[in-house]
């Protein structure tokens, strides 16, 4: 949700941050393999090119950029966004009739655009919905036992534990780990009330749970979300993960063959969203002013008055639904089995104009423009372009993750980049981006080529933009591509410093969006131009536009972080020598590959393919091979989560300095060894064949 993102400000419209979507999971019934799916075509068969292809093709970048721009100029984005916000498709909860009807519309549009092939994946997944009979409820229990009803909320939090709890109520600001640590009172055995924003609902609940809270209430405060409607309902989900939480780490194919299982990311406490009006009613019974540093409106109070309790009843129920992911492909002319994936969430709990309408509209228009460029304008992409419309994004990128889980063993050898279109337009002031470092150079080139829709200046305004880029967050559909599958991914947005206030609410309508962004068509055009240029650069050039050298600086900064603890490391009788060596090997491998590329005969597609194959493996090899994708799905040592990550290793060392008795030395020794070998593995993969690897290790 919008309120889960926190972005840096970048003056002049160029910069970083993260705009994105949810997570994912998948149940598939089509047994075809990905290559089989892509094999068929509904357009005339294209001749297989010979060993060499004309070098002249590299000169077409300016032509293609201009052609894309011309098509963008004549495209009506707002008309499509408005269409997707009509009652025929609104609301479109995942797996519902309206979601399916929109899926069919997308599928028919892809066919009309004459894409090479259009297909669908069907999955059966479990989501959580409100009970049709029993109501969720928040009540104040007076000392004499009288009940004072606060609210039966219209919104809810999917994957809450369905249960009833009573206890004291305390405020925990945004519910970040830092917020909980800084509280002057204990939350142990109490319910906590937190405001939306800064981090995902799932992280708020996990943090509350780790501090032994018994339940969580989430509301939108007036300062962060200056919405007039105090009774506005809010929706979100609390799964600390992506995909179907009841088939963790594996796809939801025919679910009967799998043992019952559930994600460790599911909360063990109830969580419920409440309106601001309900929160203010609770504050009326609470005491203690909230700290000024919270920058919160004055109605905020800290603790429920003595002799009173709050009762939270959550009656959400599990529901098995059928979801459809819709795909269309434009086949590459040289390497059709390598593809860039462009995707957008289709479903929404409410009207979902900014949440899924804009992304779906961009997806449709990009598919139309690129198909047009291929069929009419002579664009011959070397690699394939897959357009994907995901369902159940609102429940944690379920559709997207299910697809990834279904093809885990092979997808990283085929899909080399994911471009996320979700929430690409939330404002106008800033251009923010979150991505794998492999894509930073491509992003920079694109920012130097695309003008801000309002200021008319190029998006590239800050040469230091890359240092301010934020990690992809769990609620972004690009996250599982990067952290689970090891596929470089990018998510971007035109947005404000403040959160878009209507995401996850019934006010996320076209009407509100166009009111807040009168230049909506121009901004959507710019978002499409950014994504379009990414696609051209990634599919047109002979060399894959993935800058493997960018991880050198990431590894270097990790080494710098570790160097602060060299005394601690020496005290344990350990050395960083092997880690330095692995980092050095990675550096040398990147230098060698760059030299290989410069010396290569660019027109020899076999040589180029060998080089590109090495580049494609880089991200995947940053997935720790030492943890199970089922237990720790987000295996990426930089961007994932869990004890195998480089940040966890550093946190563990910090703990040694802060509280040596809590420090786990055995865990650290493992972390250091496995991180070293993972980095060494990436260096080896980049070096190519085994006889090229200098193994003096």
């Amino acid at each position: 949700h919008h309120h889960h993102h926190h972005h840096h400000h970048h003056s002049g419209g160029g910069g970083s941050g993260g705009g994105g979507s949810g997570g994912g999971g998948s149940k598939g019934v089509e047994p075809k393999t990905e290559s089989e799916r892509l094999a068929g075509t509904e357009s005339p068969v294209r001749e297989e090119p010979g060993e060499d292809f004309p070098a002249a093709r590299r000169l077409y970048w300016d032509d293609l950029k201009r052609k894309l721009s011309e098509k963008l100029d004549s495209t009506d984005f707002t008309g499509t966004i408005k269409l997707l916000n009509e009652n025929s498709y609104v609301p479109r909860e995942a797996g519902s009739q309206k979601d399916e009807n929109l899926a069919l519309y997308v599928e028919n549009q892809f066919r009309e655009f004459k894409l090479s092939k259009v297909w669908r994946d069907q999955h059966f997944v479990k989501i959580q919905v409100k009970d049709s009979i029993g109501q969720n409820m928040v009540t104040i229990v007076q000392s004499n036992g009288n009940l004072d009803p606060v609210e039966s909320p219209e919104g809810y939090v999917a994957f809450s534990k369905p249960t009833e709890v009573s206890g004291k109520l305390v405020h925990a600001n945004f519910g970040t780990k830092k917020d909980f640590e800084e509280l002057s009172y204990s939350v142990n055995g109490s319910l906590v009330i937190v405001r939306a924003g800064e981090i995902t609902f799932a992280e708020k609940v996990a943090n509350a749970q780790s501090f032994n809270a018994i339940g969580v209430l989430i509301y939108m405060d007036k300062n962060k979300f200056p919405v007039v409607e105090a009774d506005l309902a809010l929706f979100g989900h609390a799964h600390l993960g992506t995909g179907d939480p009841y088939t963790p780490g594996f796809p939801s194919f025919n679910h009967t063959q799998f043992p019952p299982s559930q994600s460790s990311g599911l909360p063990n406490i109830p969580v419920q969203t409440i309106s601001r009006a309900a929160a203010e009613k609770l504050f009326g019974k609470m005491e203690g002013s909230c700290p000024a540093r919270w920058n919160i409106d004055s109605s905020c109070k800290l603790e429920l008055s003595q002799n009173q309790n709050v009762k939270l009843i959550v009656k959400n129920v599990l529901k098995e639904i059928k979801i459809l992911n819709i795909f269309g492909v434009i086949k590459g002319f040289v390497e059709p089995d390598h593809y860039v994936v462009v995707g957008a969430q289709r479903d929404a709990w409410g009207p979902g104009a900014a949440k899924s309408g804009v992304g779906t509209a961009l997806l449709l228009k990009l598919a139309q423009m690129f198909s047009d460029m291929v069929l009419k304008d002579g664009f011959q992409p070397s690699r394939s372009i897959i357009f994907a419309s995901w369902s159940a994004g609102d429940f944690g990128s379920v559709g997207a993750t299910e697809w990834l889980e279904g093809y885990l063993s092979s997808l990283h050898l085929k899909a080399f980049t994911y471009i996320n279109l979700d929430k690409a337009v939330l404002g106008t002031s800033n251009f923010k981006v979150s991505a794998s470092p492999l894509l930073y150079t491509l992003i920079e080139k694109t920012m130097q080529n695309v003008k801000h829709p309002v200021t008319g200046q190029f998006l590239y305004q800050d040469s230091n933009w890359a240092s301010k880029v934020e990690k992809l967050t769990l609620d972004n559909a690009a996250f599982p591509f990067l952290a689970y599958s090891g596929i470089p991914a990018v998510s971007f947005c035109f947005c404000e410093d403040t959160d878009y206030p209507y995401l996850g609410t019934t006010m996320d309508t076209y009407k509100e969006l166009i009111e807040r962004i009168p230049e909506l068509n121009k901004v959507a055009r710019a978002a499409a131009e950014v994504a379009g240029q990414f696609v051209i650069k990634l599919t047109h050039d002979v060399e894959l536009n993935l800058d493997y050298e960018m991880y050198n600086s990431k590894l270097l900064s990790f080494m710098k972080d570790l160097n602060q603890f060299k005394t601690d490391i020496r005290d344990m009788g350990l050395s960083l020598q092997w880690l330095y060596s692995a980092r050095g090997d990675y550096f040398r491998a990147t230098s060698r590959l760059t030299t290989d590329f410069h010396n290569a005969e660019k027109t020899n597609r076999f040589v180029m393919r060998e080089i590109n194959d090495r580049i494609m493996k880089v991200e995947y090899h940053f997935l720790s091979p030492y943890v199970s994708p089922r237990e720790s799905p987000f295996r990426h040592i930089f961007w994932g989560s869990g004890s195998h990550t480089l940040s966890a290793l550093v946190e563990n060392l910090k703990l040694r300095q802060k509280n040596i008795t809590a420090f786990n030395e055995t865990l650290f020794r493992n972390q250091l060894a496995l991180a070293t070998w993972t980095i060494q593995g990436v260096a080896n993969a980049l070096s190519g064949d085994i006889w090229n690897i200098d193994n003096e290790f």
Partner: antibody, heavy 123, light 113 residues
Framework: EVQLQQFGVELVKPGASVKISCKAS????????MDWVKQSHGKSLEWIGD????????SYNEKFKGKATLTVDKSSSTAYMELRSLTSEDTAVYYC????????????????WGQGTSVTVSS | DIVMSQSPSSLAVSVGEKITMSCKSS????????????LAWYQQKPGQSPELLIY???TRESGVPDRFTGSGSGTDFTLTISNVRAEDLAVYYC?????????FGGGTKLEIK
């Protein structure tokens, strides 16, 4: 008891506009969509469009886009349909009807109907 | 748009008789996920507004006498009135609510001999 109250007759000149009202009672107005249906004399029924009073979103039959505009006033639980650039073809009885639950992702029939407003376009 | 065709356009029956009228849609109204047919029948008595009789092709609206029965699936639907009474004099419309725009049949006018 669910009731949709419409006013009987509107006599308007060609080229003019008319705004028909439909006041709902007996249920929570924002909980259900409101549909509008046209019936020309002796003819069948034609669906014009619907409005979701909770989200303030609409859908129109392509045939009536540019002709009809649907709005609501939540405070008075009233739905409105404005018809513009009227011609003799627009002479008909116009009904409002309660549609499906506004928060539903599924389609539903129209379960309660107003008594209709007769619009006559004549110079 | 889905085209709804009703037949006959009119029929005259005597009180106490059983009659059936047909409604055909140009595409299936069956939603496979919930196995429901998105078809409704409305009754419009002279000078009155339409009233919902049947929805989901066969479910009677509350208060509707069990003389009225809806049946059919996919593209072919039937409304049966057994033991016709004088107050059943009306035009009966079928309507699909499976896909926007919602569309109605031309109606079947029931006259009493």
């Amino acid at each position: 008891e669910v009731q949709l109250q419409q006013f009987g007759v509107e006599l308007v000149k060609p080229g003019a506009s008319v705004k028909i009202s439909c006041k709902a009672s007996g249920y929570i107005f924002t909980d259900y969509n409101m549909d509008w249906v046209k019936q020309s004399h002796g003819k069948s029924l034609e669906w014009i469009g619907d409005i979701n009073p909770d989200y303030d979103t609409t859908s129109y039959n392509e045939k009536f886009k540019g002709k009809a505009t649907l709005t609501v006033d939540k405070s008075s639980s009233t739905a409105y349909m404005e018809l513009r650039s009227l011609t003799s073809e627009d002479t008909a009885v116009y009904y409002c009807a309660r549609g499906g639950y506004s928060g539903s992702s599924y389609y539903h029939p129209m379960d309660y109907w107003g008594q209709g407003t007769s619009v006559t376009v004549s110079s | 748009d889905i085209v709804m065709s009703q037949s006959p356009s009119s029929l005259a029956v005597s009180v106490g008789e059983k009659i059936t009228m047909s409604c055909k849609s140009s595409q299936s109204l069956l939603y496979s996920t919930n196995q429901k047919n998105y078809l409704a029948w409305y009754q419009q008595k002279p000078g009155q507004s339409p009233e919902l009789l049947i929805y989901w092709a066969s479910t009677r609206e509350s208060g509707v006498p069990d003389r009225f029965t809806g049946s059919g699936s996919g593209t072919d639907f039937t409304l049966t009135i057994s033991n016709v009474r004088a107050e059943d004099l009306a035009v009966y419309y079928c309507q699909q609510y499976f896909i926007y725009p919602r569309t109605f049949g031309g109606g079947t006018k029931l006259e009493i001999k």
